[in-house]
Amino acid sequence: FEIALPRESNITVLIKLGTPTLLAKPCYIVISKRHITMLSIKSGERIVFTFSCQSPENHFVIEIQKNIDCMSGPCPFGEVQLQPSTSLLPTLNRTFIWDVKAHKSIGLELQFSIPRLRQIGPGESCPDGVTHSISGRIDATVVRIGTFCSNGTVSRIKMQEGVKMALHLPWFHPRNVSGFSIANRSSIKRLCIIESVFEGEGSATLMSANYPEGFPEDELMTWQFVVPAHLRASVSFLNFNLSNCERKEERVEYYIPGSTTNPEVFKLEDKQPGNMAGNFNLSLQGCDQDAQSPGILRLQFQVLVQHPQNESNKIYVVDLSNERAMSLTIEPRPVKQSRKFVPGCFVCLESRTCSSNLTLTSGSKHKISFLCDDLTRLWMNVEKTISCTDHRYCQRKSYSLQVPSDILHLPVELHDFSWKLLVPKDRLSLVLVPAQKLQQHTHEKPCNTSFSYLVASAIPSQDLYFGSFCPGGSIKQIQVKQNISVTLRTFAPSFQQEASRQGLTVSFIPYFKEEGVFTVTPDTKSKVYLRTPNWDRGLPSLTSVSWNISVPRDQVACLTFFKERSGVVCQTGRAFMIIQEQRTRAEEIFSLDEDVLPKPSFHHHSFWVNISNCSPTSGKQLDLLFSVTLTPRTVDLT
């Protein structure tokens, strides 16, 4: 190899060891029998050398640095050449460095031809191995603007007082042009301006200077976004830190065309603007930091550009002004992440503050819109608390548990609507009465409706789930001892059509001691399946539950248990079941931890089934499933 550098070229070539392949033996640069591991060639020098190994690219790297002095004479503006040409260099990983020094008053602009640049964060690498590292200068301090790959949106970077650009090319890369030019500009009066151009839908992730280290104190950095007028842009902060300010405040400023309040100033912790049409600027302003404990200011953010959806021009009014103790959250439904570009899906408050989730609270009227390509990516979860503090005032009072029509009219699927029903301890209990009788969901007879009610205790220390219930069964009412949550959960978009079937009334009733009482009025047509609460986890210790089962005059009920033994093993106390005829008060008592469960039995009159648990040993829980079937009395039962 021969490298000859012209005089006055201000180019230095340095060949040095990279990260060695540890299993290999050392490779050397050989110059007339001398073996060396570092070779520096300066302007005006000509050196002939070889390598002592077959694959020097596994051992050495080459750095070509050109110093461009704009202080003492005119600046060589225009397209930047790769000198010496890559064809004259040994095939090593190579880094071309241009170090431009200029006066503080002169602005320098790097212009990148297509493909534009894409900024990468710490630990990331470029797929083709070609990286652009750009840094600036504040007095004598070097400031890293960022590291960039090809195929992005960054088209121009403006700086002043000097710029250092390093282009890293892997040894196998055929590139023989720099891909950028330098132009002079008037002073930009800030650290730098980065221009990011979107031709169509897409996203860009950008970072403050020196990221992930701290942004220079009291500096200003601007990003200019060029967005076609027919598209919408949204900004979201992925990661940020604030420093400890002594004077001034760290902030971001937006210049949004058409806004009457330019510049719009936001704190970094604020929700950032979304649904912006056309071009806009974003600036990051630092502060004077506390000398003793400066902290660091840093910001990583994403700009998402996409087509406005039909929905984005529609305003939905959610009137919660007459509601109390209620919150509505619109959020993304969980999905597997895909690797391709996915347009953002945002919900916007007052059309401007857009984010991937939004919580609305009672007491106000809210105006919302959507910036989303597919609204099935979102769902709604609502919580409402109905509480009684004064038992004298609440007793016999009823509340309808219905999803308000405002919520049903939103173009987003309702997932859960939860009512938390709170009563004064040991004073009142609750009764749930459905508009349509309910079926308990079991493996034997699953619910196939578009929604179900999930009923569970709302006492933090109590792990008690009564079950999942849907319309179209035989359960006429559910009485519960104390605080519960009732969640209407939807399973299909057809809930909108079936919404009329929902309807549950809760009433506050005098206190009773049992954990729950189910009133069951079976239909002649079908078998009713019932199971103990907390199925799969076991009925909680010392808990008692009852079923009040009605048998019409002309019918006989067959009560069948689905296993021979309960399987419960008691640590303390006894587990028992009482089956009691309501008319005669005759009762049968079964010890669940000892006896076998009763064989199928026939009941001519309404009867009670009461199950009371002991304190079971772990793993030996009480789970019972039974069925009730009605048959006409005229049939010979022998």
Epitope: L17, L22, L23, A24, K25, P26, I36
Partner: antibody, heavy 116, light 106 residues
């Protein structure tokens, strides 16, 4: 298991030559530079030169140039160091070692005594 | 040729103490190697490529440095660490050794 086994001790007259051998096992000498160093009694280590068995290229410390010849026989995985025109100050333990970026394998040393 | 100067020539310390051995090059070197030698034995590879411990070397040893100044540090001396340590450069031939530092029991 990696080993470098050197030939036995030698007593030589001034002006004569000595040829020390170094047989490698457990690794391929083509993947290493085969170096020779010496250590005079109570002194430090002094690098003499090396051979790259892959291409038979050699480098010698200018101090030994003209007096030393390092060779290698790939078929027997053996490196040799011959030092001529011996003087009493050449009395030392001569070590061979194979070197790569990461691994360095040393022989046990061969004592060469030059005495009239 | 690159001259390597090791200092101090002798280091007298007690077990448990920290030892700092220095190796200074007359011109810049890419990487440095360190060897340990005990009386009557061949040198043993100790640190390669400036800071990597050779196989079997305890973690109390560490190597650092760049350019012309390099250091081998033993955080807490054990009885078996008392020996002579040599540095060597592989950056430019002849591939010289330093004069050695003897670490002896005080």
């Amino acid at each position: 298991q990696v080993q470098l086994v050197q030939s036995g001790a030698e007593v030589k007259k001034p002006g004569s030559s000595v040829k020390v051998s170094c047989k490698a096992s457990g690794f391929n000498i083509k993947d290493y530079y085969m170096n020779w160093v010496r250590q005079a009694p109570g002194q430090g280590l002094e690098w003499i030169g090396w051979i790259d068995p892959e291409n038979a290229n050699t480098i010698y410390d200018p101090k030994f140039q003209g007096r030393v010849t390092i060779t290698a026989d790939e078929s027997t995985s053996t490196a040799y160091m011959e030092l001529s025109s011996l003087r009493s100050e050449d009395t030392a333990v001569y070590y061979c070692y194979g070197s790569s970026y990461r691994f360095t394998y040393w022989g046990q040393g061969t004592l060469v005594t030059v005495s009239s | 040729e690159i001259v390597l100067t090791q200092s101090p020539a002798t280091l007298s310390l007690s077990p448990g103490e920290r030892a700092t051995l220095s190796c200074s090059a007359s011109s810049s070197v890419s990487y440095l190697y360190w060897y340990q030698q005990k009386p009557g034995q061949a040198p043993r590879p100790w640190i390669y490529l400036t800071s990597n411990l050779a196989s079997g070397v305890p973690a109390r040893f560490s190597g650092s440095g760049s350019g012309t100044d390099f250091t081998l540090t033993i955080s807490s001396l054990e009885p078996e660490d008392f020996a002579v340590y040599y540095c060597q450069q592989w950056s430019s031939n002849p591939f010289t050794f330093g004069g050695g530092t003897k670490v002896e029991i005080k």
